[in-house]
Interface confidence: low
């Protein structure tokens, strides 16, 4: 015998309370495949999350982040605070890149300048907090006295890579450090 629920298309659920009639998903819920016995609650984009794609009866909503934050994680499960170029996010907020490192984006960590001498090249343009050095021809290709050697990049300070970053995700935009996961979303009910 064919399961009567298999006839229920996406956007509906097989309602056991009504003789397995295919009922439309209630507001703020969806089913992306046919034959479902329940509809899933739509993802909601609150706080620093912004709706990129509205929920429909057949597909979940998609979120991105409000200005000043960027997405992290699968499906933008977290929003991380932007920093300026030349900075990285630490647990004390945005901090300037230390000497010998740079970051040319609003996210991520400061990375050491390229060591031109490792490739047998010289520094053509000095590095800054925002930009890597530009390596030029090798010293041998230059006339005597014209060579320039970059000092080796300093070792990164221990613990200066991203620590306890300002991540904000959906579950509980509700205490003290802003480090939240999406785990309990399915518990939220419309009331």
């Amino acid at each position: 015998l064919q399961d009567p629920c298999s006839n229920c298309p996406a956007g509906t659920f097989c309602d056991n309370n009504r003789n397995q009639i295919c009922s439309p998903c209630p507001p703020n819920s969806f089913s992306s495949a046919g034959g479902q016995r329940t509809c899933d609650i739509c993802r909601q984009c609150k706080g620093v999350f912004r709706t990129r794609k509205e929920c429909s009866s057949t597909s979940n909503a998609e979120c991105d982040c409000t200005p000043g934050f960027h997405c992290l994680g699968a499906g933008c499960s977290m929003c991380e605070q932007d920093c300026k170029q030349g900075q990285e996010l630490t647990k004390k907020g945005c901090k300037d890149c230390c000497f010998g490192t740079f970051n040319d984006q609003k996210r991520g960590i400061c990375r050491p300048w390229t060591n031109c001498s490792l490739d047998g090249k010289s520094v053509l343009v000095n590095g800054t907090k925002e930009r890597d050095v530009v390596c030029g021809p090798s010293p041998a290709d230059l006339s005597p006295g014209a060579s320039s050697v970059t000092p080796p990049a300093p070792a990164r300070e221990p613990g200066h890579s991203p620590q306890e970053q300002k991540l904000i995700s959906e579950e509980d935009l509700g205490g003290e450090q802003k480090l939240i996961s999406e785990e309990d979303l399915h518990h939220h009910h419309h009331h």
Partner: antibody, heavy 125, light 108 residues
């Protein structure tokens, strides 16, 4: 009827401990995030602590962190606040409050939509 | 943390008056702003959520408006039961949940 009822308040000496309870009725307690909010005599509202519906995520105000512990027992429809190392400045009416979630057309809003009647904690020698 | 500042701290008005209370956030909170009413010896009661949405059971003489950093709660025609303290609360960036310091509405 949707209701929250607190208990456990009383007079305690500085450095002492108390455990507040909040019992829910009229709604599916395990589906809701919960908060404790307090109000010192003649003062405004101050958020104290938060717990997610499953109890996996917890937050505290800086003024109580390390001294207070929030917990919940969904089977008993109960929320708790364990208060240690109490100080005179913890004297207040303590309210438990349900965090209601409201689906807007685009966003997901929340507000403290159900409050208990409050229980009074007095810290004095 | 986001700071919420209400004004005035207290105000006197008469039954039938139109009353406006303002709340300012220290940074933009979009429309993530709630208003509560508290009567002496009682728990706070949610009046308005999402800046302008009236909570179920709240009389229509209450209304909220605003977005970003500036919000208002308006009571169009004051009734005797409306004399109370009113609090705004942001729900944009939490924790912590932060409230305004309150506005006490008294009978003139």
């Amino acid at each position: 009827e949707v209701q929250l009822v607190e208990s456990g308040g009383g007079l305690v000496q500085p450095g002492g401990s108390l455990r507040l309870s909040c019992v829910a009725s009229g709604f599916t307690f395990s589906s809701y995030e919960m908060n404790w909010v307090r109000q010192a005599p003649g003062k405004g509202l101050e958020w104290v602590s938060y717990i997610s519906n499953s109890g996996t995520t917890i937050y505290y105000a800086g003024s109580v962190k390390g001294r207070f512990t929030i917990s919940r027992d969904n089977a008993k429809k109960s929320l708790y606040l364990h208060m240690n190392s109490l100080r005179a400045e913890d004297t207040a009416v303590y309210y438990c409050a349900r965090e209601g979630t409201i689906f807007g057309t685009v966003h997901y809003y929340f507000a403290l939509d159900v409050w208990g009647q409050g229980t009074t904690v007095t810290v004095s020698s | 943390d986001i700071q919420m500042t209400q004004s005035p701290s207290s105000l006197s008005a008469s039954v039938g008056d139109r009353v406006t209370i303002t709340c300012r956030a220290s940074q933009s909170i979009s429309s993530y702003l709630n208003w509560y009413q508290q009567k002496p010896g009682k728990a706070p009661k949610l009046l308005i959520y999402a800046a302008s949405s009236l909570q179920s059971g709240v009389p229509s003489r209450f209304s909220g408006s605003g977005s970003g950093t500036d919000f208002t709660l308006t009571i169009s025609s004051l009734q005797p039961e409306d004399f109370a303290t009113y609090y705004c609360q942001q729900s944009y960036s939490t924790p912590p949940i932060t409230f305004g310091q309150g506005t006490r509405l008294e009978i003139k």
